[in-house]
């Protein structure tokens, strides 16, 4: 039993982690600067998307890049519990805090703000430079989706790295996982064409959920053949004149559930990965 | 002046490097195994490409993946001159060999075979599993293109890393370069739509040349709307029905020169990067 409550310990760990973050601002500032620069570069490259076949390609391309970038950037989260492993074991054994207090404290003070910022920055810069769907809900859905991707990718990083002593192996494993997840995200291969004995792998792909949600959010209601009456009963399987046609070809459900089920899936992955990370920390102290 | 000729020194360095390679076969065998597995996975995912709009997406996707994979795999080439830096300086100062003998010896025995193998393996596995254009010339052009991409990416790695003492900085720099090169390769953004003040950057992109050549090789003459009932008065206006239409939309020149100019560009990049690497080794010994 502990003399201090869970909440007290949580506050203490959070405060210390946050102080460390502010006390060594180079990393945080560097990350923000890199994100801003990358956002501006992407904004410049894709500036003012057209409503034609190149508009389809460029929209899909930029949404894919943002999703995979969120994933690969999250690889750095492997350090969260690895760097302080010895300190954690020492403090835990000394009875400073519960594992749960340390775990949630680190998440709240470190993971939450550092993974939220890039999503906000990217959305704010890219959205208006590119001229994506000009509605408030679409803007915030994009921001929320990028956040969810970042959190689930970071959670996966924690699940793999928690309890390890070296970062390199976890980083390599994460990178390999993300490369395969990237293939199954839905840009490099049309997911409807993959053989059934392999296609189930797409459900384990973080970028697939993010990319699908971003596409659903952006393409719905778009017309890519301006001048052609979009209400014409299109008998052609090869033309893509509306966002709905594009999404259907990608095997994406057009209903609202077709959008939100991706966020539900990402939320489930976050819970599962964080549970694994927590259990690994819990077992770690048993063998210390 | 040296007592032994350039050729003798070249043979000696090559033989020693090759013996080291054979004496420690784990790395080489591991690379081959990883390449075979990845080839089979890609082959399974994209197995039997269709001749419809999904066929366009999947062809472009797999060619993009193979090109960027060749680039990112070549990052490991940074180690070639870094790991043996001290040994090279010691042996050069001791008069064992010319810089040129060491440089070309290492290229011949290490870089050439280790970058050629993945290209051969990938092509042999992927080509037939996917059902790419069934002609001998198209098969060998793909193999040659992947080799050229691997060599130019490796040459860039050498140019960045030569003379450095630590691998990590060079690796990071390479990775950042390849991420930007990847954006400008032509899948994630339609290169014809990029603003003129930015579009010149595409000419520095290694994967862009590889990807363009692979697409030219594969798409030319393909029919992506086969059997469309020719009498139906349909709204197929916006479809991409031929490989030529697709290539033109991507801004790719349909002439034979539209294919070979990419290999010429890659060859020029190889020469430039290897020259930089050689000069860096040459200057390195002056300051030792």
């Amino acid at each position: 039993s502990y003399t201090t409550s869970f909440c007290h310990q949580l506050r203490w760990v959070s405060k210390r982690s946050f102080k460390n973050l502010l006390g060594n601002p180079q990393a945080s500032i560097a990350q923000i600067i890199v994100t801003v620069i990358l956002g501006l570069v992407i904004g410049a490259i894709y500036f003012g998307l057209n409503n034609d076949s190149t508009g389809i390609q460029n929209r899909a391309g930029v949404l894919f890049f943002l999703t995979t970038n969120q994933c690969f950037s999250s690889v750095s989260a492997v350090e969260l519990f690895v760097v302080e492993k010895k300190l954690f074991i020492h403090e835990y054994i000394s009875g400073y805090y519960r594992v749960s207090s340390y775990f949630f404290g680190k998440l709240l003070s470190d993971l939450l703000p550092m993974r939220m910022l890039p999503s906000i920055i990217f959305t704010c810069i890219v959205y208006f430079m590119l001229g994506l769907k000009p509605t408030a809900d679409a803007f915030f859905i994009m921001m929320f989706t990028l956040m969810m991707v970042a959190y689930s990718a970071s959670s996966m990083a924690l699940a793999i790295a928690a309890g390890q002593s070296v970062v390199s192996v976890a980083t390599l494993l994460m990178t390999i996982c993300f490369v395969f997840m990237m293939i199954f995200s839905g840009l490099l291969v049309n997911l409807t064409t993959i053989a059934s004995w392999l296609s189930w792998l797409q459900y384990f792909s973080i970028p697939r959920y993010g990319f699908t949600a971003l596409q659903h959010n952006e393409f719905l209601g778009q017309n890519f053949c301006p001048g052609l009456n979009a209400t014409v009963n299109n008998t052609c399987n090869y033309a893509t004149c509306t966002g709905e046609e594009y999404l259907t070809k990608q095997g994406i459900d057009l209903s609202p559930w077709g959008l939100w089920k991706n966020h539900v899936a990402l939320a489930c992955m976050i819970v599962i990965f964080l549970t694994i990370a927590y259990l690994k920390l819990l077992f770690l102290k048993k063998y210390s | 002046s040296y007592t032994t000729s350039f050729c003798h020194q070249l043979r000696w360095v090559s033989k020693r490097s090759f013996k080291n390679l054979l004496g420690n076969p784990q790395a080489s065998i591991a690379q081959i195994i990883v390449t075979v597995i990845l080839g089979l996975v890609i082959g399974a995912i994209y197995f039997g490409l269709n001749n419809d709009s999904t066929g366009i997406q999947n062809r472009a996707g797999v060619l993009f993946f193979l090109t960027t994979n060749q680039c990112f795999s070549s990052v490991s080439a940074v180690e070639l001159f870094v790991v043996e830096k001290k040994l090279f300086i010691h042996e050069y100062i001791s008069g064992y060999y010319r810089v040129s003998s060491y440089f070309f010896g290492k290229l011949l025995s290490d870089l050439l075979p280790m970058r050629m193998l993945p290209s051969i393996i990938f092509t042999c596995i992927v080509y037939f599993m996917l059902g790419l254009k069934p002609t001998a010339d198209a098969f060998f052009i793909m193999m040659f293109t992947l080799m050229m991409v691997a060599y130019s990416a490796s040459s860039m790695a050498l140019a960045i890393a030569a003379g450095q003492s630590v691998v990590s900085v060079a690796t990071l720099l390479m990775t950042i370069c390849f991420v930007f090169m990847m954006i400008f390769s032509g899948l994630l953004v339609n290169l014809t739509t990029i603003a003129s003040w930015l579009s010149w950057l595409q000419y520095f992109s290694i994967p862009r040349y590889g990807f363009t050549a692979l697409q030219h090789n594969e798409f030319l003459g393909q029919n992506f709307c086969p059997g469309l009932n020719a009498t139906v008065n349909n709204t197929c206006n916006y479809a991409t029905c031929t490989g030529e239409e697709y290539l033109t939309k991507q801004g790719i020149d349909l002439s034979p020169w539209g294919l070979w100019k990419n290999h010429v560009a890659l060859a020029c990049m190889i020469v430039i990067f290897l020259t930089i690497a050689y000069l860096k080794l040459l200057f390195l010994k002056k300051y030792s």
Epitope: - | N51, K133, P134, T135, G221, Q222, N223, F224, C225, P226, G227, L228, A230, T231, N233, N234, T235, C236, N237, A239, C241, T242, E245, T248
Partner: antibody, heavy 118, light 106 residues
Framework: EVQLEESGPGLVKPSQSLSLTCSVT?????????WTWIRKFPGNKMEWMGY???????NYNPSLRSRISITRDTSKNQFFLQLNSVTTEDTATYYC???????????WGQGASVSSAS | DIVMTQSPSLLSASVGDRVTLSCKAG??????LAWYQQKLGKAPKLLIY???SLQTGIPSRFSGSGSGTDFTLTISSLQPEDVATYFC????????FGSGTKLEIK
């Protein structure tokens, strides 16, 4: 019902240019499809030459790419074939057709016979 | 280019006969094959596309079959008006035509 009709000189001197016109009725050439030229040689061999699409995109047979040009006049609903540096080998019956891409040709003109002889 | 070889180049048959015309592709064309009929002085007429799909308005005595590289056009009961030259066309990679089979009545 769409109808196509070829017109142009029946005789062209070697090294000169062959020019043919295809007039389309019953369908606007900018509304869709690819408007194609095909020729049939005296020995019954047939060759696809190239097309101009509804959007103005042109696609030519690689063997003819250096000397062929297909253009159109949207106001007259016509498309044209120009073949430069004609030789006796270019003696054939030239047909204009409508399709999509390389697909089967359901609509043909009646054909224009062109001879190249000095 | 994919070479299309038609055989025979000349075929004589009697009215009411079952006639089979052959077309061989230089490589697999994924069933992307069409058949045309051309009467003297007329434009070619599309009979069959996708190996076995009958074009609208074409009599049902015409049928197509085959796969891979070997294809056939069958006329179940030859009629006098079927006298013509028959061409096959592949549209799998670019488009190329066969050299034709001239069909005449004995």
């Amino acid at each position: 019902e769409v109808q196509l009709e070829e017109s142009g000189p029946g005789l062209v001197k070697p090294s000169q240019s062959l020019s043919l016109t295809c007039s389309v009725t019953g369908y606007t050439i900018t509304s869709g499809y690819d408007w194609t030229w095909i020729r049939k040689f005296p020995g019954n061999k047939m060759e696809w030459m190239g097309y101009i699409s509804y959007s103005g995109f042109t696609n030519y047979n690689p063997s003819l790419r250096s000397r062929i040009s297909i253009t159109r006049d949207t106001s007259k609903n016509q498309f044209f074939l120009q073949l430069n540096s004609v030789t006796t080998e270019d003696t054939a019956t030239y047909y204009c057709t409508r399709t999509r891409g390389y697909n089967p040709f359901a609509y043909w003109g009646q054909g224009a016979s062109v001879s190249s002889a000095s | 280019d994919i070479v299309m070889t038609q055989s025979p180049s000349l075929l004589s048959a009697s009215v009411g006969d079952r006639v089979t015309l052959s077309c061989k592709a230089g490589r697999n064309i994924n069933n992307y094959l069409a058949w045309y009929q051309q009467k003297l002085g007329k434009a070619p007429k599309l009979l069959i596309y996708n190996t076995n799909s009958l074009q609208t308005g074409i009599p049902s005595r015409f049928s197509g079959s085959g796969s891979g590289t070997d294809f056939t056009l069958t006329i179940s009961s030859l009629q006098p008006e079927d006298v013509a030259t028959y061409f096959c066309q592949q549209y799998n990679s670019w488009t190329t035509f066969g050299s034709g089979t001239k069909l005449e009545i004995k």
